[in-house]
């Protein structure tokens, strides 16, 4: 038997993936555990093997179908269970009735590219990945730029309160190396959270022309 407190958190990427993390205070050692998803209205069900990510937490991804297929809607509820093997039986360690569109976390934006760069400004674009058509334009973005001698945590956040997949960074220093990241969040969902940050895009501003500031 496993004692201690348990936390079971899952997010839907809005298309065909539910990612889950299960934390358990108390020794599990070599126990095999999995997450089982059982939707209330659909014919499929899915299982993934929980793998350790730290001493007391495990994670797995429920792959519901092809990456861009729409497998759930706002009417669906999915019963999610953590099952751990005890001898020949499976024991339910945690359970939740999961409303996918109340618990959204999209994939990180992809395909970041510099559209145009000058001495003091840089125009950058990106794309969203595996995002449901249900959102239409109801998305927001946060972006940050890493300047030399600073950390990501120190970078000020730029907020785009609409579905705008580009940004024009201003007041940059000429001939300087920067890095840029962006993340996305749907406006829908009580427990919806920001996507992971995108892979950083490195760029360099153009040097100032001689004789000009």
């Amino acid at each position: 038997a496993v004692n201690g407190t348990s936390q079971f958190t899952c997010f839907y990427n809005s298309r065909a993936n539910i990612s889950c993390v299960w934390s358990q205070d108390g020794a599990l050692q070599d126990t095999s555990c999995q997450v089982h998803a059982w939707p209330d209205r659909r014919r499929w069900n899915q299982t993934c093997e929980l793998l350790p990510v730290s001493q007391a937490s495990w994670a797995c991804n429920l792959i519901l179908g092809a990456p861009d297929s729409q497998k759930l809607t706002t009417v669906d509820i999915v019963t999610l269970r953590v099952l751990c093997r005890e001898g020949v039986r499976w024991r339910v360690m945690a359970i939740q009735d999961f409303k996918p569109f109340e618990n959204l976390r999209l994939m990180a934006p992809i395909s970041l590219q510099v559209v145009h760069v000058e001495t003091h400004r840089c125009n950058i674009s990106w794309e969203i990945s595996q995002a449901s058509h249900y959102f239409e334009r109801h998305l927001e973005f946060e972006a940050r730029t890493l300047s030399p001698g600073h950390t990501w945590e120190e970078a000020p956040l730029l907020t785009l309160k609409q579905k705008q997949e580009w940004i024009c960074l201003e007041t940059l220093t000429p001939d300087t190396q920067y890095e840029f990241q962006v993340r996305v969040k749907p406006l829908q969902g009580e427990f919806t959270t920001w996507s992971p940050w995108s892979q950083p895009l490195a760029f360099r501003t153009k040097p100032a022309a001689l004789g000009k500031d």
Partner: antibody, heavy 116, light 107 residues
Framework: QVQLVQSGAEVKKPGASVKVSCKAS????????ITWVRQAPGQGLEWMGD????????NYNEKFQGRVTLTVDTSISTAYMELSRLRSDDTVVYYC?????????WGQGTLVTVSS | DIQMTQSPSSLSASVGDRVTITCRAS??????LNWYQQKPGKAPKLLIY???GLHSGVPSRFSGSGSGTDFTLTISSLQPEDFATYYC?????????FGQGTKLEIK
């Protein structure tokens, strides 16, 4: 095998209420939504609402303006659809169905006639 | 509400014919589209779920395709028992809605 058996035909007066039952067998009643659909003679299908027997959660078609109430009795694996303030255009066949990626099993239908 | 429009409303065909019925949704419903067959005096029967999934016991001459707003039910070779009325239905969002039906008659 999965079966949904509905109660028999009813004749009601305008303004009255009717309660149609739907007894399920052959599967775990609490694990699937039960939906209600109606059909006027020679007409198409119209969704009224659904209920999840495991929790009692319901969804209703706003068209019925609070006239419809869906309930279940899990002890006898039976779902109920009550329609109040009956009008002559409620003279239709009422169906219950199990929902599992589409309405995969249906009751035989219950004809309700509203006539003064 | 999502409107579902079927075409044609009625169709005459012969045994052995290949028949196609279309269904258009008023907004994107992804693949959350089901097809039913109904004969006079009987309850509807599920044929196809989630656009192309063949319900158990349904003959393989029935197939479905489409995505987004435009969907198709195809009967590859009509059999005498296929003459009936066919309905599409979306289960993308409440209230669930049906097409108005396509009556398939013997030519």
């Amino acid at each position: 095998q999965v079966q949904l058996v509905q109660s028999g035909a009813e004749v009601k007066k305008p303004g009255a209420s009717v309660k149609v039952s739907c007894k399920a067998s052959g599967y775990t009643f609490t694990s699937h939504w039960i939906t209600w659909v109606r059909q006027a003679p020679g007409q198409g299908l119209e969704w009224m609402g659904d209920i999840y027997p495991g929790s009692g959660n319901t969804n209703y078609n706003e068209k019925f303006q609070g006239r419809v109430t869906l309930t279940v009795d899990t002890s006898i694996s039976t779902a109920y659809m009550e329609l109040s303030r009956l009008r002559s255009d409620d003279t239709v066949v009422y169906y219950c169905a199990r929902e599992r990626g589409g309405f995969d099993y249906w009751g035989q239908g219950t004809l309700v006639t509203v006539s003064s | 509400d999502i409107q579902m429009t079927q075409s044609p409303s009625s169709l005459s065909a012969s045994v052995g014919d290949r028949v196609t019925i279309t269904c258009r949704a008023s907004q994107d419903i992804s693949n959350f589209l089901n097809w039913y067959q109904q004969k006079p005096g009987k309850a509807p029967k599920l044929l196809i779920y989630y656009t192309s999934g063949l319900h158990s016991g349904v003959p393989s001459r029935f197939s479905g395709s489409g995505s987004g707003t435009d969907f198709t039910l195809t009967i590859s070779s009509l059999q005498p028992e296929d003459f009936a009325t066919y309905y599409c239905q979306q289960d993308n969002n409440h209230p669930y809605t049906f097409g108005q039906g396509t009556k398939l008659e013997i030519k």
